[in-house]
């Protein structure tokens, strides 16, 4: 299976909410013994490999933000911990996997990584990740709402705030 990032860059004004999204697709083993562990973390653009470094998102680690469920089951974090930090990760039936960040501040700017790990009998088999950048802007140059720039082309799309 693979992970695709719908947008490689999100530019948002301070105070706005944003939903960063990844989609995982390809041959998914729907056997009872296979589940998927999905999570988010911050990183930096490493010289060797993007997403190799793991940093927390608003003090929450990738363990705090994880979802662990069957192939295309819907799920979301019910952790009070995440919601207290203005975060929620979610996954739908179509392979979309997202994290919503509320009330953005300049400190939220940076590189974000989504990670999907295929688990069989509680042990990892394959892992893939996707990366995207979030720029939070303030002042007169800031957009009025979040703008997302697609990964595959230079066109931009306005996206509705979560």
């Amino acid at each position: 299976f693979k992970v695709a990032t719908l947008y490689s860059l999100y530019v948002c004004p301070e105070g706005q909410n944003v939903t960063l999204t990844c989609r995982f697709f390809g041959p998914v083993d729907k056997g009872h013994d296979v589940t998927f562990y999905k999570t988010w973390y911050r990183s930096s653009r490493g010289e060797v490999q993007t997403c190799s470094e793991r940093r927390p998102i608003r003090n929450l680690t990738f363990q705090d933000l994880h979802l662990h469920h069957g192939g295309h089951q819907a799920a979301n974090t019910s952790h009070d911990l995440a919601q207290r930090h203005g975060l929620e990760s979610a996954s739908d039936h179509h392979g979309n996997f997202s994290i919503t960040m509320r009330n953005l501040t300049l400190l939220d700017s940076g590189l974000y990584c989504c990670l999907v790990v295929e688990i069989r009998h509680h042990h990892s088999e394959h892992r893939v990740h996707g990366a995207m950048e979030l720029q939070v802007q303030t002042g007169k140059d800031a957009p009025s709402s979040c703008v997302a720039y697609p990964s595959s082309s230079q066109e931009s799309e306005n996206i509705t705030a979560a």
């Epitope: 562990y37 662990h68 952790h79 990670l115 009998h121 042990h123 088999e125």
Partner: antibody, heavy 122, light 112 residues
Amino acid sequence: EVQLVESGGDLVKPGGSLKLSCAASGFTFSSYGMSWVRQTPDKRLEWVATINSGGSYTYYPDSVKGRFTISRDNAKNTLYLQMSSLKSEDTAMYYCARHEDYEGDYYAMNYWGQGSSVTVSP
Amino acid sequence: DVLMTQSPLSLPVSLGDQASISCRSSQSILHSNGNTYLEWYLQKPGQSPKLLIYKVSNRFSGVPDRFSGSGSGTDFTLKISRVEAEDLGVYYCFQTSHVPWTFGGGTKLEIK
């Protein structure tokens, strides 16, 4: 401090049913996979069931498959083991245990409860 | 099922001595992802089991460095470099590389 406290153990007749509970505290219960392990009177340990953090995936050995059901209530920080069609060979001390994992890859049971005794006898 | 065989069944030692416990699996427990999921647990009298070693050789936090694990494939060893009174109890190896997960029969460490 991580604490796991089992309850519900009892003396039951063969063919009967019993539900064990394991109350968890001192950690974010919904972030961890959990298992039940039993210890027979001859002190042998046997893995009984495992459930992932969200409760969507369970696994059992053939010896209990179809008779035992592991479940969890993350809102109540509680793990359960529903046992039915009990046999004399199910007589054991039942422990709940928390898994340590990295990215969903379970690699150890690092915390165990004190156990709950189940006796199956006519 | 993977059969885990421990030896000896009973190991009498003097305090301060080195102790060595063997665990053999009926087939290789090297997982397809490259990890070997072999753990060691100690159960002291009247207590529940406690984790000592995971993935063959990694000590769990708080476990003294006199405990060490080694091995690969089908042969594994737990060594205690200088046995202390608090080390007495039954030691179990446990594999989760293949389902069903299986324990060894246990080795009782006792004072000579």
